[in-house]
């Protein structure tokens, strides 16, 4: 039995996968911040997690996926205000009882040190210094990402 949050995540990823190809993104679009091979867009308004997921989708992007601690630290360095939280593309899968990225992969327990509970309707946020489990209905800011790539590429859920 999938939660409404999981269904929303799957639906949006499936709709994004319907496009088989798109031109490679050589430079970050206006307003997007380049961080290594990604373009990031930080919101300055707030939304619950599923609305944030949908907003990124409308911008042909996804909620932020973090590969490892190094990428987390570099992303956090762009957050100037210690008190601000941002949704990323990670939430708790009730059916699999594990943290799951919106591209379908599971969290490597060594990647992020999460403060808070792993339970139904929990989604992950990051601040300048930490990673938190929050109720997915909490209204906070969010980060969208686009992958920079110099070639025409197939669209996968994590691109």
């Amino acid at each position: 039995q999938k939660s409404s949050i999981e269904k929303c995540s799957v639906d949006i990823q499936q709709s994004r996968n319907k496009t088989t190809e798109r031109p490679g993104l050589l430079n970050c679009p206006i307003y997007w911040q380049q961080l290594r091979e990604k373009c990031l867009l930080f919101s300055h308004t707030v939304n619950p997690w599923n609305n944030s997921l949908a907003d990124c989708s409308t911008k042909e992007s996804s909620l932020l996926l973090i590969r490892d601690k190094d990428e987390l630290i570099h992303t956090q360095n762009l957050i100037r205000d210690k008190a601000i939280l941002f949704w990323i593309g990670l939430n708790f899968s009730l059916s699999e009882k594990n943290w799951k990225w919106i591209n379908g992969s599971f969290l490597n327990s060594n990647d992020l040190e999460i403060r808070g509970d792993a339970k139904e309707n929990s989604c992950i946020s990051i601040s300048q210094t930490s990673v938190y489990s929050e109720y997915c209905s909490t209204e906070i800011r969010w980060i969208c990402q686009k992958e920079l790539t110099p070639v025409r590429n197939k669209v996968y859920p994590d691109s």
Partner: antibody, heavy 121, light 108 residues
């Protein structure tokens, strides 16, 4: 309520550098795009460029070789420098807050009152 | 660069009349990232509409925006005396950000 205030000299000599500052009061400079726009007397609006709180910039290609925009987050202030000015740079210079494409309001939602800069010897 | 062409250059109307202002882009504006501003003499522009059709905070509902792609319209349903001003469209979907040349709405 966020307010913007431009400051700087109203007269600059040809070939010199125009320098203006914009002070942001009543709110944080973080996660917005802080913009300079100009308007020559009796003419339309021209976007000069923006700076993000992180320091990343985007300039109008027509002015890029002469423009520098910088930010001082500790002072909640951002600045414009335009080098090698000519009479064609005579204009009202506005600073504005740009909401970008993620937010309750996009585009230039808050403006300073503008400051007239004349380039003349 | 996206060039925005506004028409007409001047619109002469009476208070109470409907004003229709056009803004045409030289290429499609990304995600309808188009804004409209009002400017009165000696004042800074004021944001009216963003995202082609969303009214900015505090803007009366007689102002409405529509359109997508390359054709956009600002409509003032019933002109009030304070609405006589210059109106600019602006795209913010691609760099450089660009403005239209403006439409002056004057009293007939």
């Amino acid at each position: 309520q966020v307010q913007l205030q431009e400051s700087g000299p109203g007269l600059v000599k040809p070939s010199e550098t125009l320098s203006l500052s914009c002070t942001v009061s009543g709110g944080s400079i973080s996660f917005y795009y802080w913009t300079w726009i100009r308007q020559p007397p009796g003419k339309g609006l021209e976007w000069i460029g923006y700076i993000y709180h992180s320091g990343s910039t985007n300039y109008n290609p027509s002015l890029k070789s002469r423009v520098t925009i910088s930010v001082d987050t500790s002072k909640n202030q951002f600045s414009l420098k335009l080098s090698s000015v000519t009479a064609a740079d005579t204009a009202v210079y506005y600073c504005a807050r740009d909401g970008g494409i993620v937010g309750a309001t996009n585009a230039f939602d808050i403006w300073g009152q503008g400051t007239m800069v004349t380039v003349s010897s | 660069e996206i060039v925005l062409t506004q028409s007409p250059g001047t619109l002469s109307l009476s208070p109470g009349e409907r004003a229709t202002l056009s803004c045409r882009a030289s290429q499609s504006v990304t995600s309808s990232y188009l804004a409209w501003y009002q400017q009165k003499p000696g004042q800074a522009p004021r944001l009216l509409i963003y995202g082609a059709s969303s009214r900015a905070t505090g803007i009366p509902d007689r102002f409405s925006g529509s359109g997508s792609g390359t054709d956009f319209t600002l409509t003032i349903s019933r002109l009030e005396p304070e609405d006589f001003a210059v109106y600019y469209c602006q795209q913010y979907g691609s760099s450089p950000l660009t403005f239209g040349g403006g439409t002056k709405v004057e009293i007939k």
